[in-house]
Every structure is written in structure tokens, then in C-alpha cells.
């Protein structure tokens, strides 16, 4: 229940990739505005996105303070031009979000193959260690810094001349694989967090092939 000219937000949804985290909701406002609050289970509420007509709020700055905490957000609805007005129970109408634990739930962004280098019959494939917005000691941490050995990469590789794929895994950002001399290979990688039950895998990286600019060849 609430005032006759405000409706409660609904379909509150967390959209999070590599810890960049946005809360989205419906409906598009008609004669109303929204304010968002976020809190950890044991913490105080902090207000964000004051009196906005948007239906999303970037909460990254809050969740990166401790990505292993569980967060709850709520979206308050106010009549436009009369934000002091409250619902029938004497407080603004609001709706709670689902709980969100960034470390366990943020989607893994599409990885990128940074480089590959062939030395004889070995190829070293390096995955770009993407920077996140998580900070420690005033430094932005990489995905590997945050997840450590919890994060692995799966490499798919195949001869340019055939369709048969092979795979390898690493819990660093580098693969060292055996190849046939004189053959060109293509590569794609996928990030995985084996211990998770949801949002476990990223999409595959763009395919990179030998004979193109990212690679180096040495005898």
C-alpha cells in the first residue's frame, strides 16, 4: 500500500559483471521518482541515486568495499515534486532486492587473449588479466587478484586446417601447450570458477589465430 499516485518498484534485478554492479527495476516512472538504499546484512543503510527518474542505479562503489559480503538493496518510490510524501503506513513505499554476494555471483566478463608466442613446438598463450573496480591500498585489483586460484581459464585450441579441438586449463593466466611445427593454430579461452553453483562460466573470448598480429614466432 502507499499513496495513490506512487507504485512500488518491482522486478529488482542485480546486473553485475567483473564486479561492475547495477541494480535495475521496473516500472518506468510516471509522476514518481526513486531513491535506492544498500546495506550489508549487519550494516547501516546507505542512500544512492537520490530522487532519480532512472530505473537503474550503479552500486559498484558500495559493493567493491567488500566483495565477499552479502548485500541487500531497496528502492523507495516518491511522488514527483513531493518527495516528503509517505505511504499510508507513514513511510515511503519501497521494495527489497534479492540478496547479492558479489564474489559468488558477479558474472565473469568475456576474457581476451592478450598474446601468444610460439617457440619451436610450444606456444605460450596469455590471457589478459582484466582490471576490476575492486580496490586495495588505493590500487585497482585485477580479476586474478580478487579470485586467486578460485579462477581458472579453459583454453580451446585447434589447427586452422582442421576442426578437432583440444583443451587445457590453467589457474594462472598463461598456458604452455604443445603444437605441431609448421601448423597454424586458433585459440579461444573461457573463464570458470569451479566452486560456484551459479554464473560459473564466462562466454568464450574472441578467437585469435596464429599468423595474425597478436602472435610472435621464434625458432
Amino acid at each position: 500500500s502507499g499513496t495513490t499516485n506512487t507504485v512500488a518498484a518491482y522486478n529488482l534485478t542485480w546486473k553485475s559483471t567483473n564486479f561492475k554492479t547495477i541494480l535495475e527495476w521496473e516500472p518506468k516512472p510516471v509522476n514518481q521518482v526513486y531513491t535506492v538504499q544498500i546495506s550489508t546484512k549487519s550494516g547501516d543503510w546507505k542512500s544512492k541515486c537520490f530522487y532519480t527518474t532512472d530505473t537503474e542505479c550503479d552500486l559498484t562503489d558500495e559493493i567493491v568495499k567488500d566483495v565477499k559480503q552479502t548485500y541487500l538493496a531497496r528502492v523507495f518510490s516518491y511522488p514527483a515534486g513531493n518527495v516528503e510524501s509517505t505511504g499510508s503506513a507513514g513511510e515511503p513505499l519501497y521494495e527489497n532486492s534479492p540478496e547479492f554476494t558479489p564474489y559468488l555471483e558477479t558474472n565473469l566478463g568475456q576474457p581476451t587473449i592478450q598474446s601468444f608466442e610460439q617457440v619451436g613446438t610450444k606456444v605460450n598463450v596469455t590471457v589478459e588479466d582484466e582490471r576490476t573496480l575492486v580496490r586495495r591500498n588505493n590500487t585497482f585489483l585485477s580479476l586474478r587478484d580478487v579470485f586467486g586460484k578460485d579462477l581458472i581459464y579453459t583454453l580451446y585450441y585447434w589447427k586452422s586446417s582442421s576442426s578437432g579441438k583440444k583443451t587445457a586449463k590453467t589457474n594462472t593466466n598463461e598456458f604452455l601447450i604443445d603444437v605441431d611445427k609448421g601448423e597454424n593454430y586458433c585459440f579461444s579461452v573461457q573463464a570458470v570458477i569451479p566452486s560456484r553453483t551459479v554464473n560459473r562460466k564466462s562466454t568464450d573470448s574472441p578467437v585469435e589465430c596464429m599468423g595474425q598480429e597478436k602472435g610472435e614466432f621464434r625458432e
Epitope: 581458472i152 579441438k165 583440444k166 583443451t167 587445457a168 586449463k169 589457474n171 569451479p194 560459473r200 562460466k201
Partner: antibody, heavy 117, light 107 residues
Framework: EVQLVESGGGLVQPGGSLRLSCAAS????????MHWVRQAPGKGLEWVGW????????IYDPKFQDRFTISADTSKNTAYLQMNSLRAEDTAVYYC??????????WGQGTLVTVSS | DIQMTQSPSSLSASVGDRVTITCKAS??????LSWYQQKPGKAPKLLIY???GWAEGVPSRFSGSGSGTDFTLTISSLQPEDFATYYC?????????FGQGTKVEIK
Amino acid sequence: EVQLVESGGGLVQPGGSLRLSCAASGFNIKDYYMHWVRQAPGKGLEWVGWIDPENGNTIYDPKFQDRFTISADTSKNTAYLQMNSLRAEDTAVYYCARDTAAYFDYWGQGTLVTVSS
Amino acid sequence: DIQMTQSPSSLSASVGDRVTITCKASRDIKSYLSWYQQKPGKAPKLLIYYETGWAEGVPSRFSGSGSGTDFTLTISSLQPEDFATYYCLQHGESPFTFGQGTKVEIK
């Protein structure tokens, strides 16, 4: 509860084909890798191949690459193993297994394939 | 391809004995090794992963050690329900390969 149930095994003549199914419940196969492993009577375990059901990527032991095809239908939450040009030495119990990328944590009960004339 | 050499192929032991099974990889597989127990007519069951981590519900008498190329599964005090066949699996690169298996029998 996580469960994998294989079906489709049976008696087939040499040169014949068979399609095995692995029906998953209690999780979405697209979130995991799915493998097929076989075991000939009285012998050890032999890895056949895997699929990432989300993108269709498949990897095989090269010895099976030409005759076996792994596929998946995420709407049915089921993985498949299509086996062609079957030989007597393909007689085995075929298992499907779920892979977290760190280990195979759940296995089906297996389905017996017998290749004989 | 990576070969996994498992030994012994079989062993006889008594309840309460300490049992050690080894797996040797033909080249470095880092931590991508897991151990499985299989009883007759049943599917394999995960015991140990990342060479040292316990699977859910696995008794602490089972332990894993090693890295690189040499790995060991130890059963500190064999129990009646432990008589089974044990397999190692390398899943660091394809084709994934199992050891030949070790059958643990009652002495």
C-alpha cells in the same frame, strides 16, 4: 538433488549406430561441462570426450573423433553420445559425468552397450 | 598425450592397514589430478580433487598429496567399505587420461 541418468544402451551389430542420452536433473547442464567415459568389461575407465553445452564446444579423445559425436540440448537438459561404425571393442558401460572444471563430481549409473553379431 | 602410470595394479591389505597408491604423469599436470573410487557394478565416486582437496562426505582417512608429475592417494586406516578399485584422472589437458586402476582386496 543432482542426478544423471543414461539411457539408449543395448545390443547392436558391428557397423551399427547407437545414440546414448544423459538426462540431467537438479542443475542446468549449460553451467557445467559434460563428459562421456566408458569402461569395457573388467577393464579400466577410458575418457571419450566432453561438451560445453552452453556454446557447443566439443573435445574428444582423438581415437573417437571420427566415429563419435557429443551433443547437448539445453532445453531438454540432456547430453548425447552418437556412436557410429561400432566395433566389438566398443562394448562397454558408458557413463556421463558432470565436470565443475576442477573434478567430475556426479556420475550417472551407466548404460551397457554390447556390439556383437 | 599425457600418460598416467598408476601403481600397484592391485594390492591385498587388512582392515586398519595404511594403504598408498601412486600415480605418475608423463609430464607436469600441475594440480589437475583427482582420485575416484569404484565398487563393482557402480559408477565411480569422487574422493580427492586438485590433488589434495576432499570431496564432500569423504572420510578424512583418505588424503591426497603431490604435484607436478607424482601424486599419492593414502588411506590411513583401511575400513571394510574401502575395498574397491581406485583411479586417478588428469584433466589438465585433453585427452584426459585415467590411471589403469588399483584394486584393493582383502588379505
